[in-house]
């Protein structure tokens, strides 16, 4: 019995004065608590307590489930306990079935004995399995069996408590260990897509999987910058033991302008949080915009190839696409697809292949594109360079030497003079009167240009060169003078 | 005996946080796990979530998750259920219930939220 | 998660006769033979009552007309001889694996 200093409170004193007492089954159990300030007897097994106000407790009969702590507590809040075994050869065990572990933790296996002589107080596999290699534990009679540091792999592990009782093995009844698992990283959380575009009244639904050890991982969605709480609905899996899915879907049945955002999918569980997110982008209605990926004005020379091309960005997508030319479409020379294979691709691109171009072909080709909200056109202006062709030559009445060329860009014509029978003309000859012919017609196409000269001005043989020539390249018509006295006898024209 | 007195009925506006409370004994308070059961008026029993013995984990239903949290205060023997963010159907009695040997042994008295306007 | 089916929603039995109520579960609850399934009985304005425990143990204090079998998916809750203080609605409730569930409850009457 404890002893303290006379003046001092004292703890209340038991009878018997034992630590532990053990009685039959069916014997009567009597301990007396003496204090002059006795408050209440307490009574404790497998953690649950009864209680009595008298300071004499006396079970007449007792039995198994009457083994535990009995602890007098007197006015000063002082205690002392006893511990008393009900042997029961029948019950050697007090359970409590419930039997969860902690990853990494230890457990207690509540199995406390009802006898202390047994031996060989230990754990064992049901069935006769042999407990895991690494399975760690201490006995202790009166509370049972304490696992330590509990594996993921004990998970459902069947166990029973066994003692030795006259040399034969005794098992407990069943226990199931259920292990929940340390978190040992952060969730891992993906999003099906990272963003959208809708138009408004349409539907916006987002799906966030989550990815651990358990169901107890925390997830929600956010809005950016917003504390508003987001209407989510779930779904999970468990794919066999610690491989936890949930899918939590964000919905707004009628997305508007103002629900454009970023939306935050956050995780988190003991261990750390992770998060992904999507954007989310609501047009008041569907749009087209056109971007040329060459200049909208093209020149090509005569007889080659061109590739008109554009991207464009549609939402919703397109439906009609066409490339036009002076009022006909084209049924083929053209390709269109979208620019990537991603589900939310809103950019195309469309190409037309213009091959060998006639300078015949120049014009405006448009590309017109539609879907159920908009139409868009673009166009390009195709300018075929030509080499300058000269149309006419000729003397005129009033005795003017005339060249007419055409060609794109529009042609210069010189005039050169060569004496007597040379074809290497040198000096120029200013011409009288320059026009271009066609400036108030059609802006595509070869432009014509016509010059003419004072043929008066020659005194002598000789050859009159009439050049045209442009960017693309030259052709020269020539007029031959041959002089019988005073007379031009006459003018012979070739090119 | 263990016993387990649940707070008082609780009247909420939507939108609103209720925090019920559970104060037990007759046992170790520490030493079980504590779960949260609730029942819509005429409907059946429908499980929230559980406080674990020992170190406080918890594990909720999946329809609760974000929105219920289960704590213990180790020194009044006191668990607590807090459901935010109420609704017209959060209308229900709300249990505690003490696990014991794999069954719910012993339960609250029971709490009844009211969600109006 | 879980799902627990309970059959019949509602039961009128004679006083005297047989009650019984069944309850599957959509994957088994049992582990190495135990089977984590429970019955429990409600009262209007009380709060349930454990009846049966694991499937066929008979809780301390419940009369011994109540009895549970089965094992797997398939369990059975029956009372040999119905009783007046026996009307109430009875549930079915699984703790194999978190969630916890119950059945959807049979209210039990008399004919």
């Known amino acids: 019995q404890p002893s303290v200093s006379p003046g001092e409170p004292s703890p209340p004193s038991i009878h018997p004065g034992k630590s532990d007492l053990i009685v039959r089954v069916g014997d009567e159990i009597r301990l007396l608590c003496t204090d002059p300030g006795f408050v209440k007897w307490t009574f404790e097994i497998l953690d649950e307590t009864n209680e009595n106000k008298q300071n004499e407790w006396i079970t007449e009969k007792a039995e198994a489930t009457n083994t535990g702590k009995y602890t007098c507590t007197n006015k000063h809040g002082l205690s002392n306990s006893i511990y008393v075994f009900v042997r029961d050869p029948a019950k050697l065990f007090l359970v409590d079935r419930s039997l969860y572990g902690k990853e990494d933790n230890d457990t207690l296996v509540r199995c406390p004995l009802t006898d202390p002589e047994v031996t060989n107080y230990s754990l064992k596999g049901c069935q006769g399995k042999p407990l895991p290699k690494d399975l760690r534990f201490i006995p202790d009679p009166k509370a049972g069996i304490m696992i330590k540091s509990v594996k993921r792999a004990y998970h459902r592990l069947c166990l029973h408590c066994s003692v030795d009782q006259e040399g034969k093995s005794v098992l407990s009844e069943k226990f199931i260990l259920k292990v929940r698992p340390a978190f040992k990283a952060v969730p891992v959380v993906s999003v099906s897509k990272a963003s959208y575009l809708l138009r408004e009244g349409e539907e916006f639904t987002v799906t966030c999987t989550i990815k651990d050890v358990s169901s107890s991982v925390y997830s929600t969605w956010k809005r950016e910058n917003s504390q508003t709480k987001l209407q989510e609905k779930y779904n999970s899996w468990h794919h066999g033991d610690f491989n936890y899915e949930r899918q939590a879907t964000l919905t707004i049945s009628s997305a508007r302008v103002n629900d454009s955002g970023v939306f935050m999918c956050y995780a988190n569980n003991t261990f750390g949080s992770a998060n992904v997110t999507t954007t989310l982008e609501v047009v008041d209605k569907g749009f087209i915009n056109i971007f040329p990926m060459i200049n909208t004005t093209v020149f090509v020379n005569d007889g080659e190839n061109v590739d008109l091309i554009v991207e464009y960005e549609a939402f919703p997508k397109p439906e009609h696409q066409q490339w036009i030319y002076m009022n006909r479409t084209f049924t083929d020379k053209w390709e269109d697809y979208p620019k990537s294979e991603n589900e939310s691709n809103i950019r195309y691109v469309s190409e037309l292949h213009l091959t060998r171009l006639k300078g015949t072909e120049g014009g405006t080709y448009t590309f017109l594109v539609s879907n159920s909200d908009v139409n868009a056109a673009i166009a390009f202006n195709v300018y075929v360079n030509t080499k300058p062709e000269i149309l006419t030559y000729d003397r005129l009445v009033n005795g003017m030497l005339q060249c007419v060329a055409a060609g794109f860009p529009e042609p210069t014509i010189d005039w050169y003079f060569c004496p007597g029978t040379e074809q290497r003309c040198s000096a120029s000859v200013l011409p009288v009167d320059v026009q271009t012919l066609n400036s108030s017609g059609p802006p595509f196409g070869k432009l014509v240009v016509q010059s003419s000269i004072d043929s008066s001005a020659f005194k002598h043989n000789g050859t009159v060169e009439c050049k045209a020539y442009n960017d693309v390249g030259k052709t020269s018509a020539y007029f031959n003078f041959a002089f019988k006295g005073n007379n031009k006898e006459q003018i012979h024209p070739h090119t | 005996q263990v016993q387990l007195v649940q707070s008082g009925a609780e009247v909420k506006k939507p939108g609103a946080s209720v925090k019920v409370s559970c104060k037990a004994s007759g046992y170790t308070f520490t030493s079980y796990n504590m779960h949260w059961v609730r029942q819509a008026p005429g409907q059946g029993l429908e499980w929230m979530g559980v406080?674990?013995?020992?170190?406080?984990?918890?594990s909720y239903a999946q329809k609760f998750q974000g929105r219920v949290t289960i704590t213990a205060d180790k020194s009044t023997s006191t668990a607590y259920m807090e459901l935010s963010s109420l609704r017209s159907e959060d209308t229900a009695v709300y249990y505690c219930?003490?696990?014991?040997?794999?069954?719910?042994?012993?339960w609250g008295q029971g709490t009844l939220v009211t969600v109006s306007s | 998660d879980i799902v627990m089916t309970q059959s019949p929603d509602s039961l009128a039995v004679s006083l005297g006769e047989r009650a019984t109520i069944n309850c599957r579960a959509s994957?088994?609850?049992?582990?190495?033979?135990?089977?984590?399934m429970h019955w429990y009985q409600q009262k209007p304005g009380q709060p349930p009552k454990l009846l049966i425990y694991l499937a066929s143990n008979l809780e301390s204090g419940v009369p011994d007309r109540f009895s549970g079998s089965g094992s797997g998916t398939d369990f059975t809750l029956t009372i040999s001889s119905l009783q007046a203080e026996d009307v109430a609605v009875y549930y079915c409730q699984q703790n194999n694996e978190d969630p916890y569930t119950f059945g959807g409850g049979t209210k039990v009457e008399i004919k």
């Open positions: 219930a003490r696990e014991r040997d794999t069954r719910f042994g012993n």
């Open positions: 406080i674990y013995s020992g170190n406080g984990d918890t």
């Open positions: 994957e088994s609850v049992d582990i190495y033979g135990q089977s984590f």
